[in-house]
């Protein structure tokens, strides 16, 4: 006569997580009596996970019917799937005693939860950078199992090279997380580009997640400078014109200098913006010359983004 | 499904005698099969149950002067050293109790034991 | 071994009546539920009814209900029918295998 078999026919079962996971386990003979239970994890430190005899666990029940007369089948169903809830679980039979001797053991099955990525959060650098810069950007996704994951880095459609990616742990673990940089060279025509970080995973059925930076977030261009005078006016008045020309951000502050001295002083706002997304600001100075004996230097000094000023200076000449 | 006894009779003090317990219907492989007996005008006494070779149990008056064995289709006590207070009906059952209760139940045999 | 102590040993009672027997262990039967009635008819071998403290086996009327946990368990018949006329049995199981007994049985009969 066949001794008792526990029998767990799958070797694996692999979940989505917050779904139900059915773990299979069948004995070939209702003897000896006493209980089946379930563990996860084998030795001493194994957790129990449900008790046909005894106990509350609220989100275990059993798929059949155990008081049902001639019972074989102890297949459980565990609830609301958790990354935490992967790891090998055994069907244990036990024979009735005072305390219950365990009796033979299933092969066991590990359940494996599958965990969608955290939608990839894209930071970029603290302070802004000029053209021909580099920057780097940051992509981070969290909480996906398997570890197995693609991710990858477009600007403008094109794929970065210049990437450095890590998935931890390194070991074993219920969840990953990624984390990936990509070194960007800055142009002046970026203001209007974006850095996407494209994570693919086997929960997201071949729809990848993406998350986004703008690269208007990271970069300064500087403005160029022109000062230009106009012709003399016959009321003595001549009108030099400050070109401020392919700046961005808008945030910029023109003063103007005769001979050192402050003339006006204007903030940039609500300028149109143009194509590549820069910004250009004309800015003009009517000199009266009859009220000066020697020529006059101009200056048009200009402060952008905070950053240190640049001055473009112009002499108006003065006829005796 | 059905379970009959047979194997019963007269025995004299000291003797020995071995019943038997066929299955029709149903397979004993998964299943113990339990032994009650019943003395005249008396109430049921659980004697022991039936599983493979090495799980077989008996109560403890029991033991020692019965023992047991089982096929796929029929269980077999073996009653030995037999007293007048053995006299009973003996009934064999499907079950090894707790979860899998005794039933359903042979008609039972009588075993009288007089000299 | 455990002690099974039914009450009463025997009771009158008329069809339609509700009757209630008491089995008592005299420690925690295994798993707290380990107790199963049986009834029997003379000249007939016990039929199940009740296990597992509570479950009706298959077949059996459901005015047969059991209750009860440890070591306090109880048969109730709601509605008394005349083919019910019968001696209940209660079998408890102890902790160890081997450790099954009956109590003496409550024998039902017509007032």
């Known amino acids: 006569e066949e001794e008792l078999q526990v029998i767990q026919p799958e070797k694996s079962v692999s979940v989505a997580a917050g779904d139900s996971a059915t773990l299979n386990c069948t004995v070939s003979s209702l003897i000896p009596v006493g209980p089946i239970q379930w563990f996860r994890g084998a030795g001493p430190g194994r957790e129990l996970i449900y008790n046909l005899k005894e106990g509350h666990f609220p989100r275990v029940t059993a798929v059949s019917d155990p008081t049902k007369r001639n019972n074989m089948d102890f297949s459980i169903r565990i609830s609301n799937i958790t990354p935490a809830d992967a790891g090998t679980y055994y069907c244990v039979k036990f024979r009735k005693g005072s305390p219950d001797v365990e009796l033979k053991s299933g092969a066991g099955t590990e359940l494996s939860v599958r965990a969608k990525p955290s939608a990839p959060v894209v930071s970029g650098p603290a302070v802004r950078a000029t053209a021909e810069h580099t920057v780097s950007f940051t992509c981070e996704s969290h909480g996906f199992s398997p570890r197995d994951i693609t991710l990858k880095w477009f600007k403008n459609g094109n794929e970065l090279s210049d990437v450095q990616t890590n998935v931890d742990p390194a070991g074993k673990s219920v969840s990953y997380s990624i984390r990936s940089t990509a070194r960007v060279l800055l142009t002046r025509r970026d203001v209007h580009s974006q850095v996407i970080c494209e994570v693919a995973h086997v929960t997201l059925q071949g729809d990848p997640l993406r998350g986004t930076a703008n690269l208007s977030e990271a970069i300064r261009v500087p403005p160029f400078l022109e000062v230009t005078q106009q012709s003399m006016r016959a009321d003595n008045q001549v009108n030099v014109t400050c070109q401020v020309t392919k700046f961005y951000p808008q945030r910029l502050q023109l003063t103007w200098l005769e001979n050192g001295n402050v003339s006006r002083t204007e903030m940039a706002s609500a300028l149109p913006e143009n194509k590549d997304g820069t910004y250009n600001w004309t800015s003009w100075l009517l000199v009266n010359v009859s009220a000066h004996r020697d020529d006059v230097k101009l200056t048009c000094q200009v402060e952008h983004d905070g950053q240190p000023a640049v001055n473009k200076s112009f002499s108006v000449k003065v006829s005796a | 499904r059905q379970l009959v006894e047979s194997g019963g009779g007269l025995v004299q003090p000291g003797g020995s005698l071995r019943l038997s317990c066929t299955a029709s219907?149903?397979?004993?492989?998964?299943?113990?099969i339990s032994w009650v007996r019943q003395a005249p005008g008396k109430g049921l006494e659980y004697i022991g149950t039936?599983?493979?070779?090495?799980i077989t149990y008996f109560a403890s008056w029991a033991k020692g002067r019965f023992t047991g064995s089982k096929t796929s289709s029929t269980a077999y006590m073996e009653l030995s050293s037999l007293r007048s207070e053995d006299t009973a009906v003996y009934f064999c059952?499907?079950?090894?109790?707790?979860?899998?209760?005794?039933?359903?139940w042979g008609q039972g045999t009588l075993v009288t034991v007089s000299s | 071994d455990i002690v099974m102590t039914q009450s009463p040993s025997s009771l009158s009672a008329s069809v339609g009546d509700r009757v209630t027997i008491t089995c008592q262990a005299s420690?925690?039967?295994?798993?707290?539920?380990?107790l199963a009635w049986y009834q029997q008819k003379p000249g007939q071998a016990p039929k199940l009814l009740i296990y597992?403290?509570?479950t009706l086996a298959t077949g059996v009327p459901s005015r047969f209900s059991g209750s009860g946990s440890g070591t306090d368990f109880t048969l109730t018949i709601s509605s008394l029918q005349p083919e019910d006329f019968a001696t209940y049995y209660c079998?408890?199981?102890?902790?160890?295998?081997?450790?099954?007994?009956f109590g003496q049985g409550t024998k039902v009969e017509i007032k």
């Open positions: 059952a499907r079950g090894s109790a707790w979860n899998d209760p005794f039933d359903p």
């Open positions: 420690q925690s039967v295994y798993g707290n539920n380990d």
């Open positions: 219907g149903f397979s004993l492989s998964s299943h113990g």
């Open positions: 079998l408890g199981g102890g902790d160890d295998e081997a450790d099954n007994t």
């Open positions: 039936i599983g493979t070779g090495v």
């Open positions: 597992l403290a509570s």
